[in-house]
């Protein structure tokens, strides 16, 4: 029961995490204009992995896609790649873990196969979460570096009279969504790996023991107590616990993306 709960919870946590990773990847607020030096700006800039946006005094928001691949910074490309790899691995992990769930019966799939699949999906979730955390962290580091660089030469004199403030960017909401989502996916993956161990306990071999009774020479060879590890076939004396085939409809809710007006 505890194993089923751990596996189910791991699946749900990972599902939420991957939904969050997808949401973060699609969000436009990876970096937002730092308002510390210009709190009264009527033009608010923010940027995502795929496009940059400007919200004007009218409330109108205009977004422009990055219609170039070669012209983009290598770091941005790397972040994109990490997030996409994280999503792909997470999606495959979800697919595998659905079939691995103990509460769902598919044909005559053995516990050994389910344990294997649980471990596989768990590893995929862990790698997916790490990819997301790495991607977000690389972007955050890039922001911090650029922030201090732009602070160093923030005011560029124009004819010695007029000062123009260079736009600085700080952490956007997507970074926090990405970190939390990556963490959840990672935790979900760890839970799946723990559940796998529960599905596949250590193999125990009971050696035959001879009992010598007076007047009789009888040898008892207890059989059918070889514990299934989930990795070897154990067709004899295998008890199938079937609590009834349950189909649990998972409600999947992806955070929606908003242009804040």
């Amino acid at each position: 029961m505890a194993v089923t709960a751990c596996q189910g919870l791991g699946f749900v946590v990972s599902l939420i995490g991957i939904a969050g990773i997808i949401a973060a990847t699609c969000m436009d607020q990876w970096s937002t204009q730092d308002l510390y030096n210009n709190p009264v700006t009527a033009v608010f800039n923010y940027q995502g992995l795929w496009r940059s946006c400007v919200r004007e005094s009218s409330g109108f928001t205009e977004c422009r896609g990055y219609f170039t691949l070669l012209g983009l910074p290598a770091m941005l490309q790397a972040v994109r790649a990490l997030m996409i790899v994280g999503i792909v691995l997470g999606a495959i992990g979800l697919l595998v873990s659905i079939f691995a769930l103990k509460c769902i019966r598919i044909g005559s799939m053995e516990d050994s196969a389910k344990a294997n699949m649980t471990l596989t999906s768990g590893i995929m979730f862990i790698v997916s979460g790490l990819c997301a955390i790495a991607g977000v962290s690389v972007f955050a580091n890039m922001l911090v570096t650029n922030f201090w660089m732009s602070t160093a030469n923030m005011y560029t004199g124009m004819g010695g009279m007029v000062q123009t403030v260079q736009t600085r960017y700080t952490f956007g909401a997507a970074l926090f969504v990405g970190w939390v989502a990556g963490g959840l996916t990672l935790i979900g993956g760890v839970m799946m790996c723990i559940a796998c161990r529960g599905l596949a306990p250590e193999e125990t071999n009971y050696k035959a023991v001879s009992y010598h009774a007076s007047g009789h020479s009888v040898a008892y060879k207890p059989g059918g107590f070889k514990a299934s590890t989930g990795f070897g076939s154990n067709t004899k004396n295998k008890k199938i616990y079937d609590g009834g085939a349950r189909t649990e409809d998972e409600v999947q809710s992806y955070p929606s993306k908003h242009d804040y007006v």
Epitope: T41, N45, V54, E56, S58, F60, T164, T167, V261
Partner: antibody, heavy 115, light 113 residues
Framework: QVQLVQSGAEVKKPGASVKVSCKAS????????IHWVKQAPGQGLEWMGY????????NYNLKFKDRVTLTSDTSISTAYMELSRLRSDDTAVYFC????????WGQGTLVTVSS | DIVMTQSPDSLAVSLGERATINCKSS????????????LIWYQQKPGQPPKLLIY???TRDSGVPDRFSGSGSGTDFTLTISSLQAEDVAVYYC?????????FGGGTKLEIK
């Protein structure tokens, strides 16, 4: 087509309050900010502030902040500008404006403050 | 606050001639996020609300005749009417659309010589 229709002219005594309405039509009311602009007789334009009907957010010109209240009612697509503690120099035409680059303006509401 | 200074205060130009109105801001209106200048030009005729001509310093609003053009960047901007028509007689205002409070120039009264 986009239209902003303002309430009629008002005559008020000093110290009183006035509430001017601006009814919007032809666009999604919650998508754009509604700005208010003052124009005293024979004078230039002066921005008073804006209300964002989508989230209720607002921004005021500090010159008017303590006396102006901007509100909106999304159910009837109407924005309001209330000016309190009226003085004689508040006599002016008040416009509401919206759209990109203030593309759309109300016809203006003349508020006369006279004792 | 950003101060908008328009020049001249009034201008008389012959029909068919070019009219040029200048606007200077005390701070740059250039937004590095999208490489645009946030300056607006309006035309106002007596008893009417202002009419949008140009936004983002050089983008003509829909329905505005192409004889109206805006140029400039940073702190110096210009509105040009290439060939003055009788219906262009009005007061023209520039506006800072970059920083709150949004501020307007004092206006330039355009008349026919």
């Amino acid at each position: 087509q986009v239209q902003l229709v303002q309430s009629g002219a008002e005559v008020k005594k000093p110290g009183a309050s006035v509430k001017v309405s601006c009814k919007a039509s032809g666009f999604t009311f919650t998508s754009y900010n509604i700005h208010w602009v003052k124009q005293a007789p024979g004078q230039g334009l002066e921005w008073m502030g804006y209300i964002s009907p989508g989230n209720g957010g607002s921004n005021y010109n500090l010159k008017f902040k303590d006396r102006v209240t901007l509100t909106s009612d999304t159910s009837i697509s109407t924005a309001y500008m209330e000016l309190s503690r009226l003085r004689s120099d508040d006599t002016a035409v008040y416009f509401c404006a919206t759209g990109r680059g203030f593309a759309y303006w109300g016809q203006g509401t003349l508020v006369t403050v006279s004792s | 606050d950003i101060v908008m200074t328009q020049s001249p205060d009034s201008l008389a130009v012959s029909l068919g001639e070019r009219a040029t109105i200048n606007c200077k801001s005390s701070q740059s209106l250039f937004n590095s996020g999208n490489q645009k200048n946030y300056l607006i030009w309006y035309q106002q005729k007596p008893g009417q609300p202002p009419k949008l001509l140009i936004y983002r310093a050089s983008t003509r609003d829909s329905g505005v005749p192409d004889r109206f053009s805006g140029s400039g960047s940073g702190t110096d901007f210009t509105l040009t009417i290439s060939s003055l028509q009788a219906e262009d007689v009005a007061v023209y205002y520039c506006q800072n659309d970059y920083s709150y409070p949004l501020t307007f120039g004092g206006g330039t009264k355009l008349e026919i010589k």
